[in-house]
């Protein structure tokens, strides 16, 4: 199900993004579920539609709910669903963990926090930066775009930062805040050749004509934070963006799954109304890193209806 | 292979090589090369499907492999040359699954000699 999670705080900008992606090209029409009422699209509203964004300014929290996007296309529709809550602004410093976005881990070399969500905003620098509500000062620490450095991480430096930022919106200025937390690892990482753990190589995956289907591609690079690593689908030696196909969407699963203390990579191939056409192609699940690349071909077959007895 | 010759140290070659016949797209290409009395040492490659690069560390960052696909040509742009760098270099396609400067690939040319004096 092509379901979002979003979260924002009251009195704050929220842009949320349609779980379904389209070419620009397409419309895409919002409706509140519950009622099954159509979001406008003028701006002067509150809430209102801009395309695959749908946007609180600001946000309240009777705007909670489930949302409704629908990506219309001269052949298809699609649809999604954007399941938006809003939470009242905490007194005291503690953030919430219903508030808290992906942790992400440092180490000495690479100590990048990225700001959640700033690229749906109309932002302009310098964001400004909490670590356990206190601003962050001193020449350790440095905004760069949307991201914070920091400058020889230590095992202090873990804890829970906030970006704030200001969302511009036909001239008016609203408040946006995302909190994440950050951990340091402290054990010597590496790096290895990419190791493909899905799919087998030249693995036919079986589907169904007019269904939907997923493909992963999931691979390890080494241990710790690994530095240019990547997983990605080509579909005839073409990247998916290139390919034309929107019926065929590319998206990350967990970013960096550090289970058995491995590095690891999934990316997930969504085919939505399977065509014959689709089994004439080979899916390569490429994963790359500093050392080199490794390629795993999938092809589609039409799973045959099995008789169910009883 | 083309592009070899004699270069004092620092200087700079730009070799190429014609991959006609060779398919372009799901490939990996290199070059490797072979100084007199030691082992074959890969040096770059290159993946067609997206021109994704790979580099052996003793040329990183000195040492750059394109393609242009309309001219199905392959080359390799050799900067801050250094005496070790002497040897016959072999522009290579085919290396199955994998793509990387140590690639073993199925398919390699005559090889074009290059020299650099200190």
């Known amino acids: 199900k092509f379901s979002k999670q979003s979260w924002g705080l009251e009195n704050e900008a929220l842009i949320v993004r349609c779980p379904r992606q389209g070419k620009p090209s397409y419309t895409v029409d919002w409706y509140y579920s519950q009622t099954n009422k159509s979001i406008p699209t003028q701006e002067r509203n509150r809430v209102f539609a801009s395309g695959q964004l749908l946007k609180f300014l600001p946000a309240a929290v009777a705007d909670s709910g489930i949302y409704t996007c629908i990506v219309r296309s001269p052949t298809f529709n699609r649809t999604g669903y954007a399941n938006v809550t809003i939470y009242k602004k905490q007194s005291d410093c503690n953030v919430p963990d219903y508030l808290m976005y992906s942790t992400v881990s440092g180490s000495e070399k690479n100590s990048k926090i990225y700001c959640p969500t700033i690229d749906l905003y109309n932002w302009t620098a310098p964001l400004e930066w909490f670590k356990n509500c206190q601003a962050l000062q001193g020449s350790r620490y440095r905004a760069h775009k949307s991201f914070l450095v920091i400058d020889n991480v230590m095992t202090e430096d873990a804890g829970d930062y906030t970006c704030k930022f200001i969302h511009n919106e036909n001239g008016a200025n609203y408040s946006v805040t995302a909190t994440r937390s950050f951990t340091v690892k402290d054990e010597q990482g590496f790096s290895l050749f990419p190791v493909i753990g899905a799919p087998a190589q030249n693995e036919i995956k079986e589907v169904e004509i007019g269904k939907n289907a997923n493909l992963t591609c999931s691979a390890c690079f080494g241990k710790g934070t690994q530095f240019l690593a990547a997983v990605l689908w080509q579909l005839n030696g073409t990247k998916i963006t290139d390919f034309g196909e929107p019926r065929i969407q590319q998206e990350e699963g967990q970013n960096q799954s550090f289970s058995n203390g491995l590095a690891c990579l999934d990316m997930v191939l969504r085919i939505a109304d399977v065509k014959e056409e689709d089994l004439l192609l080979q899916y390569d699940c490429l994963a790359l890193n500093l050392h080199g690349l490794r390629r795993h071909t999938v092809r589609l077959s039409r799973k045959n209806p099995i008789d169910h007895h009883s | 292979e083309s592009g070899g010759g004699s270069v004092q140290a620092g200087g700079s070659l730009r070799l190429s090589c014609a991959t006609s016949?060779?398919?372009?797209?799901?490939?990996?290409m290199g070059w490797f090369r072979q100084a007199p009395g030691k082992e074959r040492e890969g040096v770059a490659a290159?993946?067609?499907?997206?021109?994704?690069?790979f580099y052996a560390d003793s040329v990183k960052g000195r040492f750059t492999i394109s393609q242009d696909n309309a001219k199905n040509t392959l080359y390799l742009q050799m900067n801050t040359l250094k005496p070790e760098d002497t040897g016959i270099y072999y522009c290579a396609a085919e290396a199955g699954d994998e793509c990387s400067a140590s690639s073993v690939f199925r398919s390699w040319g005559q090889g074009t000699q290059v020299t650099v004096s200190s």
């Open positions: 290159i993946y067609t499907s997206g021109g994704f690069t």
């Open positions: 016949g060779v398919t372009y797209r799901r490939t990996c």
